[in-house]
Amino acid sequence: YFGKLESKLSVIRNLNDQVLFIDQGNRPLFEDMTDSDCRDNAPRTIFIISMYKDSQPRGMAVTISVKCEKISTLSCENKIISFKEMNPPDNIKDTKSDIIFFQRSVPGHDNKMQFESSSYEGYFLACEKERDLFKLILKKEDELGDRSIMFTVQNED
């Protein structure tokens, strides 16, 4: 069971300092951006991270949403990353959810974050290059210190 707490506005970057944004096709991608580019591309670069209390504490439970016209929320349904047309819910009456991730700091690196799926244990949000695009995907952690599953989260409130 998850109950919504507060939300904050954040910019999310991979460890190559590329900024996460949602493109015109509602795809979450990473791109090199100056701070000015990041501001100019808002709200597509500004993510709403909503925190949830968890009846089984397993780290900080969060949803990740973006408001471009309508609010959309990140989902990993069937291990495929997409944005669903929905607000962060008030409650989720389940112990797992495709839209809940556990945000945890990387041991020894308090400023680096990982997001583990609550639906798929051991699977994390990751940045993966596919042709010329840097995509947000769900990836099974296969090695310690995998930089592709680490991010920085900069609060914009």
Partner: antibody, heavy 122, light 113 residues
């Protein structure tokens, strides 16, 4: 034939509690998201709460958040609304309404029950 | 929250004449990604629950007579009853489902002149 039948309404004092039920029939209840909508006497409609068909997704109106709890039992084809810390302004006919959306988010209401009256008064 | 404002509050129309009800949202309910307006219309007769008439601003619900039609886009919408019948006496509500909380207009009462 789709049927939604509400029960559990009645008179209660301020700060009291009530539990409303909605018995559904004529459709596969577990496949549909469900809502509660209320209507104060002589007034308009106010959406109260939503429970998705899958994923356990719940939304509430700000006016009831923290006081009302929506739940469902797919095995019993039933939707519930637990109402605590009731106030005078909660006096209304409460309708159970089926959502057209089977997803994670409320849309519009294609079937409604007849409603059950909740009166909060000292 | 999106505020829905209906006008007029009440309307008296002769049998067989056209009735027009307006609904205005405080912000757009048109989602450009799918070009859909997230707006529905309901009819509520005295002592009865509401009944869905129109969704996606202009799609008529199955079984609803074709004298009922919905139009508009963005923030301004209209429900039209092309030829008012005695059984159309009711209160009509618009509702947005663009974002939570879902919100309704205040209602328009339609009567026979």
């Amino acid at each position: 034939e789709v049927q939604l039948v509400e029960s559990g309404g009645g008179s209660v004092q301020p700060r009291g509690s009530l539990r409303l039920s909605c018995a559904a029939s004529g459709f596969t209840f577990s496949s549909y998201s469900m809502n509660w909508v209320r209507q104060a006497p002589g007034k308009g409609l106010e959406w109260v709460s939503y429970f998705s068909s899958s994923g356990g997704i719940i939304y509430y109106a700000d006016s009831v958040k923290g006081r009302f709890t929506i739940s469902r039992d797919n095995a019993k084809n039933s939707l519930y609304l637990q109402m605590n810390s009731l106030r005078d302004e909660d006096t209304a006919v409460y309708y159970c309404a089926r959502d057209d959306s089977s997803g994670y988010y409320p849309y519009f209401f294609d079937y409604w029950g007849q409603g059950t009256l909740v009166t909060v008064s000292s | 929250d999106i505020v829905m404002t209906q006008s007029p509050d009440s309307l008296a129309v002769s049998l067989g004449e056209r009735a027009t009800i307006n609904c205005k949202s405080s912000q757009t309910v048109l989602y450009r990604s799918n070009n859909k307006n997230y707006l529905a219309w309901y009819q509520q007769k005295s002592g009865q629950p509401p009944k869905l008439l129109i969704y996606w601003a202009s799609t008529r619900e199955s079984g609803v007579p074709d004298r009922f039609s919905g139009s508009g886009s963005g923030t301004d919408f209209t429900l039209t009853i092309s030829s008012l019948q005695a059984e159309d006496v009711a209160v009509y509500y618009c509702q947005q489902y663009y974002s939570t909380p879902l919100t309704f207009g205040g209602g328009t009462k339609v009567e026979i002149k």
